[in-house]
């Protein structure tokens, strides 16, 4: 049927022409819309790790590029911590002693993993290289 009528070619041409691409750069955007849902099911990469690698951050050395957790909860809280001396305090106003140890208040960010990503490589734990 395709050989005789070229209906797929004609329909595709009509769809593509309906987007009114002004230049060749617009075409990949359409491809992204079509392919992204499928590539997301195959593998997802962690943008934060990519940025850290680009910035030559030491923290990125042992991190995997493959994104594992897609839903996380970040909780910022303040905790009391001991310090060797008052010189190590966050600020003079946030510094005290219990008579034995010196204490200060420190901001801590706690990240809780809630839901894993839905892609093939999420549980593979393969090395990046």
């Amino acid at each position: 049927v395709e050989v005789a009528t070229h209906y797929l070619e004609i329909i595709t041409q009509l769809i593509v022409e309906s987007f009114h691409f002004k230049n060749g750069e617009d075409a990949p955007d359409l491809l992204k819309v079509i392919t992204k849902p499928f590539t997301k099911l195959i593998v997802q990469l962690d943008k934060k790790v990519i940025s850290q690698i680009a910035m030559n951050d030491e923290k990125a050395k042992n991190k995997s590029l493959v994104k594992i957790w897609c839903k996380t909860f970040t909780n910022k809280t303040q905790i009391n911590v001991t310090v060797p001396s008052t010189a190590n305090c966050t600020s003079p106003s946030l510094c005290w002693t219990d008579g034995i140890q010196n204490w200060t208040m420190k901001n801590v960010t706690y990240k809780e993993n809630i839901a894993k990503c839905q892609h093939i490589f999420v549980n593979f734990h393969l090395p990046d290289l």
Epitope: N80, T82, W96, T97, D98, G99, I100
Partner: antibody, heavy 122, light 107 residues
């Protein structure tokens, strides 16, 4: 309600070792929020801090008594103990166990035992 | 060690009187000062901590003030149950030290 109770012999001979135990009830001695301490008061005189202990076993002593004092903790029995060696008549006093908060502003002794009189005499 | 001195060493007062006891530290201790009340044959009882904070369950007629080296305990209207010995204690550093005490008796 937190309660502290001292126990031990009321009479100790000179040059011997004074041993006292403080039993904590109404709360765990393993609480990270408190230190446990010993304070004494000779008859008709003022109060003197002997030393304190954290449940992990870290100890803090009064330098004037440090060479003779050992404070220990037994978390399984919810108790902490005081040992004072080579006692003399000057060590005759009412011995109190108490607690003071860790991590809060200053060391205030908010709960005390009723005290036990220890007399050093032959 | 930090030495604390109290004045007066004793005072006689009547029920309803306003009583003031002072405590002086040998060096600055910021607000790390506590006040205790002791009655004969009993353990000391915490009244005021951190110079001016009233311990839970303590009557509001007791108040504390001061910072650095000079501190004051005030009983606004002396009650019969307030006749006792009062001690200050520094909690700035070890060894923790107590003042010699102030005995408040009936005039």
């Amino acid at each position: 309600q937190v309660q502290l109770q001292e126990s031990g012999p009321g009479l100790v001979k000179p040059s011997e070792t004074l041993s006292l135990t403080c039993t904590v009830s109404g709360g765990s001695i393993s609480s990270s929020s408190y230190y446990r301490g010993w304070i004494r008061q000779p008859p008709g005189k003022g109060l003197e801090w002997i030393g304190s202990i954290y449940y992990s076993g870290s100890t803090y002593y009064n330098p004037s008594l440090k060479s003779r004092v050992t404070i220990s903790v037994d978390t399984s029995k919810n108790q902490f103990s005081l040992k004072l060696s080579s006692v003399t008549a000057a060590d005759t006093a009412v011995y109190y166990c108490a607690r003071h908060p860790r991590g809060s502003y200053g060391a205030n002794f908010d709960y005390w035992g009723q005290g036990t009189l220890v007399t050093v005499s032959s | 060690e930090i030495v604390l001195t109290q004045s007066p060493s004793s005072l006689s007062a009547s029920v309803g009187d306003r009583v003031t006891i002072t405590c002086r530290a040998s060096q600055s201790i910021s607000s790390y000062l506590n006040w205790y009340q002791q009655k004969p044959g009993k353990a000391p009882k915490l009244l005021i901590y951190a110079a001016s904070s009233l311990q839970s369950g303590v009557p509001s007629r007791f108040s504390g003030s001061g910072s650095g080296t000079d501190f004051t305990l005030t009983i606004s209207s002396l009650q019969p149950e307030d006749f006792a010995t009062y001690y200050c204690q520094q909690s700035y550093s070890t060894p923790f030290t107590f003042g010699p005490g102030t005995k408040v008796d009936i005039k």
